[in-house]
Interface confidence: low
């Protein structure tokens, strides 16, 4: 009775079970009653990452510099190339097929978390006592200047976008 199912790492063809090719190799010819499955290693810049019966290896992903991509991890015969984005950009998807500019935090907002290759800048509003007067992808909210420690007094209150302005204390003559 011919098999209707095969063991793991085998496949059914012509009513018989043949061995699958191991990762990094492609199928050249199926097994027969007398011969084993014939497999060949993938070529340069090709890969197969599973036990398979593929007749063609997959091309490594191309990290297109025109899309802001660069190689994070070079592919092998068993793994695909992993792309990431150039500095100042982050991936638009898990597959990292393209990149977008990191967002800048507007004045009044500071960077809570600097962008990474896969996530955008996270901004937060500057709380009372802190300010940011620039649009930046790196700057956190800065604390207002402490006039007292400089033996000065506050002449103009700070906001979330501006520092306090310190001035000399009025002296009694």
């Amino acid at each position: 009775e011919p098999p209707t199912a095969c063991r793991e790492k085998q496949y059914l063809i012509n009513s018989q079970c043949c061995s699958l090719c191991q990762p990094g190799q492609k199928l050249v010819s199926d097994c027969t009653e007398f011969t084993e499955t014939e497999c060949l290693p993938c070529g340069e810049s090709e890969f197969l990452d599973t036990w398979n019966r593929e007749t063609h290896c997959h091309q490594h992903k191309y990290c297109d510099p025109n899309l802001g991509l660069r190689v994070q991890q070079k592919g092998t015969s068993e793994t695909d190339t992993i792309c990431t984005c150039e500095e100042g950009w982050h991936c638009t998807s898990e597959a990292c097929e393209s990149c977008v500019l990191h967002r800048s935090c507007s004045p009044g907002f500071g960077v809570k978390q600097i962008a990474t290759g896969v996530s955008d800048t996270i901004c937060e509003p500057c709380p009372v006592g802190f300010f940011s007067n620039v649009s930046s992808a790196f700057e956190k909210c800065h604390p207002w200047t402490s006039c007292e420690t400089k033996d000065l007094v506050v002449q103009q209150a700070g906001t979330n976008k501006t520092d306090v302005v310190c001035g000399p204390q009025d002296r009694l003559r």
């Epitope: 899309l67 991509l69 100042g88 638009t92 998807s93 097929e97 992808a137």
Partner: antibody
Framework: QVQLVQSGAEVKKPGSSVKVSCKAS????????MNWVRQAPGQGLEWMGN????????NYNQKFKGKTTLTADKSTSTAYMELSSLRSDDTAVYYC????????????WGQGTLVTVSS | DIVMTQTPLSLPVTPGEPASISCRSS???????????LHWYLQKPGQSPQLLIY???NRFFGVPDRFSGSGSGTDFTLKISRVEAEDVGVYYC?????????FGGGTKVEIK
């Protein structure tokens, strides 16, 4: 090749809503932001906002916030732009356009959908 | 919002002659990564806009080399070295460095 095919012209009553679709083909839909641009009759171009179809994140032009809702259906590679509380000055051609990333410019455009708001 | 101002509003041209369109932005379009996020689009009569030049100087696929972009910071120019009949339409400059992205008012190029 990259193609963006938009739904047909619409005639709507003031106060109603309209949903325009933009079906993408020829590229990985989730890899590129989809933008929407408005062109009123005889006027220039106005950027309304965009959506990242992978995560569903949106950016809106403040002018269109609350008026416009952008969505995307990954399973059908289709982006949608819904306009609510329509007024006569919403009469325009609405374009979807793909953001060519790293180009950071709108590299492929749909054919446009004319929305006419009239009582 | 960044305001994009184009001149002239209308440009009558003679085929075979050069043409030039100016665009000025209210803020610098140069990013800290050294790229300038200024683009040019052409909308031919009855058609959707199409990308001509991206990031100041780069011609998009299939755009003839008679089109070139130049400029720096806030002043930009689109040049057509020898105008052809098929170049008629409205040309728009646009910035994508700050949301909301904005377009110039357009320059209508027509054959004399």
């Amino acid at each position: 090749q990259v193609q963006l095919v938009q739904s047909g012209a619409e005639v709507k009553k003031p106060g109603s809503s309209v949903k325009v679709s933009c079906k993408a083909s020829g590229y990985t839909f989730t890899g590129y932001n989809m933008n929407w641009v408005r062109q009123a009759p005889g006027q220039g171009l106005e950027w309304m906002g965009n959506i990242d179809p992978y995560y569903g994140n949106t950016n809106y032009n403040q002018k269109f916030k609350g008026k416009t809702t952008l969505t995307a259906d990954k399973s059908t590679s289709t982006a949608y732009m819904e306009l609510s509380s329509l007024r006569s000055d919403d009469t325009a051609v609405y374009y979807c356009a793909r953001l060519g990333l790293q180009l950071y410019a709108l590299d492929y455009w749909g054919q446009g959908t004319l929305v006419t708001v009239s009582s | 919002d960044i305001v994009m101002t184009q001149t002239p509003l209308s440009l009558p041209v003679t085929p075979g002659e050069p043409a030039s369109i100016s665009c000025r932005s209210s803020q610098s379009l140069v990013h800290s990564n050294a790229n300038t996020y200024l683009h040019w689009y052409l909308q031919k009569p009855g058609q959707s806009p199409q990308l001509l030049i991206y990031k100041l100087t780069n011609r998009f696929f299939g755009v003839p080399d008679r089109f070139s972009g130049s400029g720096s910071g806030t002043d930009f120019t689109l040049k057509i070295s020898r105008v052809e009949a098929e170049d008629v339409g409205v040309y728009y400059c646009s910035q994508s460095i700050h949301v909301p992205w904005t377009f110039g008012g357009g320059t209508k190029v027509e054959i004399k």
